[in-house]
Interface confidence: medium
């Protein structure tokens, strides 16, 4: 689809091409399985163009179909971690608020590995907040080439 001259003058945000790529800031306190994210040019190769961060969680500002992707590498890891440390380590990405739209979008288990990565297309609405929950006892790496999370607006 070709853009009109008027459209070409508009910033990407106004065209609906919302996009974000985040890096891990920190894990939550003991009873909080959420991963807390950060983004911005001062932090390296992370950015937010449209979506915003709310207390470390990604909030969507434009309705549409999005590609959601995530990679998490465990910093403290072992091929026998799942058996030795009782609770299998699982990563889940979902809409956590508003409560009326709460749903799991991605669920992955580390099993015998130290890195998981996945992506999917899914409809998201303005105000949806995405949470990434890491359950189990293992710690994620904060290295920016090993753990990252992002969304890309694809179409209305």
């Amino acid at each position: 689809q070709r853009l009109s001259r008027a459209q070409q003058q508009l910033p990407l945000e106004s065209l609906g091409w919302d996009i974000a790529e985040l890096q891990l800031n920190h894990t939550g306190p003991q009873q909080d399985p959420r991963l807390y994210w950060q983004g911005g040019p001062a932090l390296g190769r992370s950015f937010l163009r449209g979506p915003e961060l709310d207390k470390g969680q990604l909030r969507i500002r434009r309705d549409g179909i999005y590609m959601v992707h995530i990679q998490v590498t465990l910093a403290i890891c072992s091929s026998t971690s799942t058996s030795r440390h009782h609770h299998p380590t699982t990563l889940a990405v979902g809409i956590c608020s508003p409560a009326s739209r709460s749903i799991s979008l991605l669920r992955l288990s580390f099993h015998q590995g130290c890195t998981i990565a996945s992506q999917r297309l899914t409809p998201l609405a303005r105000g949806d907040t995405l949470c990434t929950n890491l359950t189990g006892t293992l710690l994620p790496s904060r290295n920016t080439d090993e753990t990252f999370f992002g969304v890309q607006w694809v179409r209305p």
Epitope: H26, T27, A75, I76, C77, T80, L139, S141, R142, E146
Partner: antibody
């Protein structure tokens, strides 16, 4: 300046208990995972236990699992190691060590150590 | 458990000489998560190298690390009097974290 100061070592009989403490300063204690590493006289370094910044995740070497408990009090900037059912082979200098910012388990700062001697 | 074997056990050299220390792992170290530490008598270990080749803050550039997979090397390009100590490698890619038993660099 990062400082780690261990205390609580001493002599104890086999089967006894000791509680080691590590007072931390010079960094935001609750943001960093911490470990205990030990070194028997003239021997290699051996990792003992680790704990996440929040205290919610703990890890142990097989040799101490079920006998030692690592914990932390972030309000006091202090790391602990409760050692029960002590054995002669637990005799060592015990170091507390700070993990680096990425949660990677290499140790960027170490304390000077406290000696634990288990002997009858 | 990943076993780290350091060699030689002792290295006798003179100040100004080059020191090459080896650390061999029993299986591949994930993402080259290998560190080197220096320890002097009665002191705590001090971090020199992490990620197999990255120098820690404040470490002189005469210290360098290299290697991948199962074979790693610490090189001290020109030994200074303060470099005579015991050097340990440590892998942090897998639980339990393990150390080598050290290489002692002594004055010849």
């Amino acid at each position: 300046e990062v400082q780690l100061l261990e205390s609580g070592g001493g002599m104890v009989q086999p089967g006894g208990s000791l509680r080691l403490s590590c007072a931390a300063s010079g960094f935001t204690f609750s943001s960093y995972a911490m470990s205990w590493v030990r070194q028997a006289p003239g021997k290699c370094l051996e990792w003992v236990s680790a704990i996440s910044g929040s205290g919610g995740r703990t890890f142990y070497a097989e040799s101490v699992e079920g006998r030692f408990t690592i914990s932390r009090d972030n309000s006091k900037n202090t790391l602990y190691l409760q050692m029960n059912s002590l054995r002669a082979e637990d005799t060592a200098v015990y170091y507390c060590a700070k993990h680096d910012y990425s949660n990677y388990p290499y140790f960027d700062y170490w304390g000077q150590g406290t000696l634990v001697t288990v002997s009858s | 458990e990943i076993v780290l074997t350091q060699s030689p056990g002792t290295l006798s050299l003179s100040p100004g000489e080059r020191a090459t220390l080896s650390c061999r792992a029993s299986q591949s170290v994930r993402s080259n998560y290998l560190a080197w530490y220096q320890q002097k008598p009665g002191q705590a270990p001090r971090l020199l190298i992490y990620g197999a080749s990255s120098r820690a803050t404040g470490i002189p550039d005469r210290f360098s690390g290299s290697g991948s997979g199962t074979d790693f090397t610490l090189t001290i390009s020109r030994l200074e009097p303060e470099d005579f100590a015991v050097y340990y490698c440590q892998q942090y890619g897998d639980l339990p974290f393990t150390f080598g038993c050290g290489t002692k660099v002594e004055i010849k």
